[in-house]
């Protein structure tokens, strides 16, 4: 069992993966699907200027299993951070999720 500090370090180090897993979970809920997250293939972030530390749009290309078959998906996740604690995500929203082909 990790300490509270170790859990926080892990959270900060794997943020992109967390967001990708969130995207798959949200898609599964919305579409009543059963995709299983595999890995992040590519990630790009676009931040709002001037408040780039507050809101960020993540463009993720991820691999997920659909009925045992690996496929590629593109997800767009909008993230809002706490302006007083910029490493804390206050709110996240899946804005787009679409298949892009077989992995």
């Amino acid at each position: 069992m990790g300490s509270r500090l170790e859990e926080e370090l892990r959270r900060r180090l794997t943020e992109i993966e967390e967001l990708a897993r969130f995207a798959v979970d949200e898609h599964n809920k919305k579409e009543n699907a059963l995709l299983e997250f595999v890995r992040v293939v590519k990630a790009k972030e676009q931040s709002s200027v001037p408040h780039w530390w507050w809101t960020t749009m993540y463009y993720l290309t991820l691999e997920a299993k659909d009925g045992g078959k690996k496929k590629l998906y593109e997800a767009k996740v909008w993230v809002k951070r706490d302006p007083n604690m910029i490493f804390k995500i206050n709110f996240k929203e899946l804005q787009e999720f679409k298949p892009v082909g077989d992995a």
Epitope: G2, S3, R4, L5, E6, L9, M85
Partner: nanobody, 122 residues
Framework: EVQLQESGGGLVQPGGSLRLSCTAS???????????MGWYRQAPGERRVMVAA???????MYRESVQGRFTVTRDFTNKMVSLQMDNLKPEDTAVYYC?????????????WGQGTQVTVVQ
């Protein structure tokens, strides 16, 4: 109040190596040893992200993109943390910040060094 002083940045070619070091002051060894120490980096126009850290238990943890290339080590008796960066890539170019994370029970508190520039260019 924890103060952090970094050293060791510079200009290097792709595939090269650099070693960053950081020493903490203004805090007792026992207090610091209850905190995590590590490194963040910030590329131009991007958010500051954690790269590697050593927990208060001595466990080293890494961001996926640097795993196998970077090695973080912590000297608990001398209040130091180092980052050995090997097989550097252009995308590793950033200002690297020494970082200490304290668990204050109700929240986490971050302490920062002033930053050291690492530039990877052909």
């Amino acid at each position: 109040e924890v103060q952090l002083q970094e050293s060791g940045g510079g200009l290097v070619q792709p595939g090269g190596s650099l070693r960053l070091s950081c020493t903490a002051s203004g805090v007792t060894i026992s207090a610091l040893n209850a905190m995590a120490m590590g490194w963040y980096r910030q590329a131009p126009g991007e958010r500051r992200v954690m790269v590697a850290a050593v927990s208060e238990r001595g466990n080293a943890m890494y961001r996926e993109s640097v795993q196998g290339r970077f090695t973080v080590t912590r000297d608990f008796t001398n209040k130091m943390v180092s980052l050995q960066m090997d097989n550097l890539k252009p995308e590793d170019t950033a200002v690297y910040y020494c970082h200490v994370l304290e668990d204050r029970v109700d929240s986490f508190h971050d302490y920062w060094g002033q930053g050291t520039q690492v530039t990877v260019v052909q």
